[in-house]
């Protein structure tokens, strides 16, 4: 229903704490360079204004849309053009064009320093002094680096952060309590970020229909006992929630997500037997829990899929009468029977089924034509299964770091024109799939691997879109979202690439590498590895292994030497010569 004052309505629904958090996230995601203090000031002004509207919905400007109110605040920031360039042109537009202009200027790779965690004592001191400001800084720093982060989920992670600090800052050894717990939250939040970015990409490029299909498949896997009408209702609501967040309507998004969680908990009987534990939790934890709830037990008496979708004499009639509904039913029925498949695979199968019906229903004898459709799914199913087996075997053999290096070589050969930092970031993220998925039970591996890889490759596509350099990457990124991963997997060495000249300085290292944290050391070595491949794209795995082993030995020796600088300056050039010879 329509409210006299949208801002008063959302403030009342969400409560002051969540309202302020969401407004801070919104501002930080739109204007990513502004400081926390600048945004905090705006948030306070907006909150004070919201309170006046709660007191009197007819007060001046209370009837304005949220985008108008927020946009006016952002456009009033001094030096907007100096700091943000052409984004300032958005302020010449009216709503809703202005908001969509802001959205299109969000930067997926802002030039901000990595979010460094202060040491434990300092963190606990500032947390105890002012928990609200401390958590505000967290929301601001994450939101500006991840401008599409799912806002209500970010509130959940901030709550987790808060609980960890409350617990660990009371311990004697704060460091050993905080580090593993905060590392865990960081890892989960980063995965959440790339997954949500993929959802927004899907909405941006392919629209509501594509996202809703994704939601139907995912929900059908999780809730195989829910009927098609229930799944459709949930998918429609989930699409609306995600669309709102991707569109910058964060207050509406959080409010509607809470409504959806409430609906699910009130209708457990028709949705799933696994929801009660989630439903007992407070709001943010409840919604998070529901989003990753375990699959319900599949009904025992499900008939074979062929009955309604291959053997039925009315297949073409049913399809012609309501194409979207018929295909939606197929996706639902297939997905609920296959929690062991990735959503991407399920969508590829539905697409294959649709193409088959389009072709066969126009022929003289449709049943003879589409009769073999399920058998034709086989190669589509085998391909990702083989991918999982091959890659998990490799991961188990090499460990995470070695597996990342293998992927780095592979992807540098596929797209050597891509910048080395992007290749290293992509390979490190792709390589984490091993740790994340390969240790899971067999029936959970495929969905974990493929849907995670798809999200990471979406980021590769977004970064490449900014500065397109590789025809291979452009080709894979131009197709549909579900075909991207198979496309990247199928890429081979780029034969059009002219190898980079060998530059000694690229492989020259100094003693400062010795004091770097392990992660930074790995990145330095992986940067060198990518550069080696760019110099010799057809180097064999054996040659590259020889060089990298030599390199590791060199670092180990010089970092243990009494005079590190001398060791690096004398042994370094020898290493470069040996590398050149090994790759000759």
């Amino acid at each position: 229903e329509a409210h006299k004052s949208e801002i008063a309505h959302r403030y009342n629904d969400l409560g002051e704490q969540h309202f302020k958090g969401l407004v801070l996230i919104a501002f930080s995601q739109y204007l990513q360079k502004c400081s926390y203090d600048e945004h905090a000031k705006l948030v306070q002004e907006v909150t004070d204004f919201a309170k006046t509207c709660v007191a009197d919905e007819s007060a001046a400007n209370c009837d304005k849309s949220l985008h108008t109110l927020f946009g006016d605040k952002l456009c009033a920031i001094p030096n907007l053009r100096e700091n943000y360039g052409e984004l300032a042109d958005c302020c010449t537009k009216q709503e809703p064009e202005r908001n969509e202009c802001f959205l299109q200027h969000k930067d997926d790779n802002p030039s901000l320093p990595p979010f460094e965690r202060p040491e434990a004592e300092a963190m606990c001191t500032s947390f105890k002094e002012n928990p609200t400001t401390f958590m505000g800084h967290y929301l601001h720093e994450v939101a500006r680096r991840h401008p599409y982060f799912y806002a209500p989920e970010l509130l959940y992670y901030a709550e987790q952060y808060n609980e960890i600090l409350t617990q660990c800052c009371a311990e004697a050894d704060k460091e050993s309590c905080l580090t593993p717990k905060l590392d865990g939250v960081k890892e989960k939040a980063l995965v959440s970020s790339v997954r949500q970015r993929m959802k927004c990409s899907s909405m941006q490029k392919f629209g509501e229909r594509a996202f809703k299909a994704w939601a139907v498949a995912r929900l059908s896997q999780t809730f195989p006992n829910a009927d098609f009408a229930e799944i459709t209702k949930l998918a429609t609501d989930l699409t609306k929630v995600n669309k709102e967040c991707c569109h910058g309507d964060l207050l509406e998004c959080a409010d509607d997500r809470a409504e959806l969680a409430k609906y699910m908990c009130e209708n457990q009987a028709t949705i799933s037997s696994k929801l009660q534990t989630c439903c007992d939790k407070p709001l943010l934890k409840k919604a998070h829990c529901l989003s990753e709830v375990e699959h319900d037990t599949m009904p025992a008496d499900l008939p074979a899929i062929a009955a309604d979708f291959v053997e039925d004499q009315e297949v073409c009639k049913n399809y012609a009468e309501a194409k979207d509904v018929f295909l939606g039913t197929f996706l639902y029925e297939y997905s609920r029977r296959h929690p062991d498949y990735s959503v991407s695979l399920l969508l590829r199968l539905a697409k294959k089924y649709e193409a088959t019906l389009e072709k066969c229903c126009a022929e003289a004898n449709p049943p003879a034509c589409y009769g073999t459709v399920l058998a034709e799914f086989q190669p589509l199913v085998e391909e990702p299964k083989n991918l999982v087996k091959t890659n998990c075997d490799l991961y188990e053999k090499l460990g995470e770091y070695g597996f990342q290096n293998a992927i780095l070589v592979r992807y540098t050969q596929k797209a050597p024109q891509v910048s080395t930092p992007t290749l290293v970031e992509a390979a490190r993220n792709l390589g984490r799939v091993g740790t994340k998925c390969c240790t899971l039970p067999e029936d959970q591996r495929l969905p974990c691997v493929e849907d995670y890889l798809s999200a990471i490759l979406n980021r590769v596509c977004l970064l490449h879109e900014k500065t397109p350099v590789s025809e291979h990457v452009t080709k894979c990124c131009s197709g549909s979202l579900v075909e991207r991963r198979p496309c990247f997997s199928a890429l081979t060495v780029d034969e059009t690439y002219v190898p980079k000249e060998f530059k000694a300085e690229t492989f020259t290292f100094h003693s400062d590498i010795c004091t770097l944290p392990e992660k930074e050391k790995q990145i330095k070595k992986q940067t060198a590895l990518a550069e080696l491949v760019k110099h010799k794209p057809k180097a064999t795995a054996e040659q590259l292994k020889t060089v990298m082993d030599d390199f590791a030995q060199f670092l180990d020796t010089c970092c243990k030497a009494a005079d590190k600088d001398t060791c690096f300056s004398t042994e370094g050039p020898n290493l470069v010569t040996r590398c050149k010879d090994a790759l000759a």
Epitope: L103, Q204, F206, G207, E208, R209, K323, D324
Partner: nanobody, 125 residues
Amino acid sequence: EVQLVEFGGGLVQAGGSLRLSCAASGRTDSAYRMGWFRQAPGKEREFVSAINWSDGRTVYLDSVKGRFTISRDNAKNMVYLQMNSLKPEDTAVYYCAADPDSRLYYTVPQNYDYWGQGTQVTVSS
């Protein structure tokens, strides 16, 4: 393929009303979003309003809110733009457009795959 044809434009006095119609033929299913854009001489094409086939959700440019109303008739495959209290600054060629996928950004012309040929609206003072 979808074909769009607009009609109903014309010359009107400031403060007057016009009703634009857009006839859609071809496959338009529930996923479609229909939009109205306008282009004044020497200016960029500007978003005016949009409506979803599926749920009838609407959105408007701030300067036309309260004056213009978008509506649809699913059975007839028609979309309408009722324009009241017209102002000289509303003078432009008005285009009907269709986005078959209801993509995220509804004010961006590039997200609409199908366009009508346009109908001229002139508001004299």
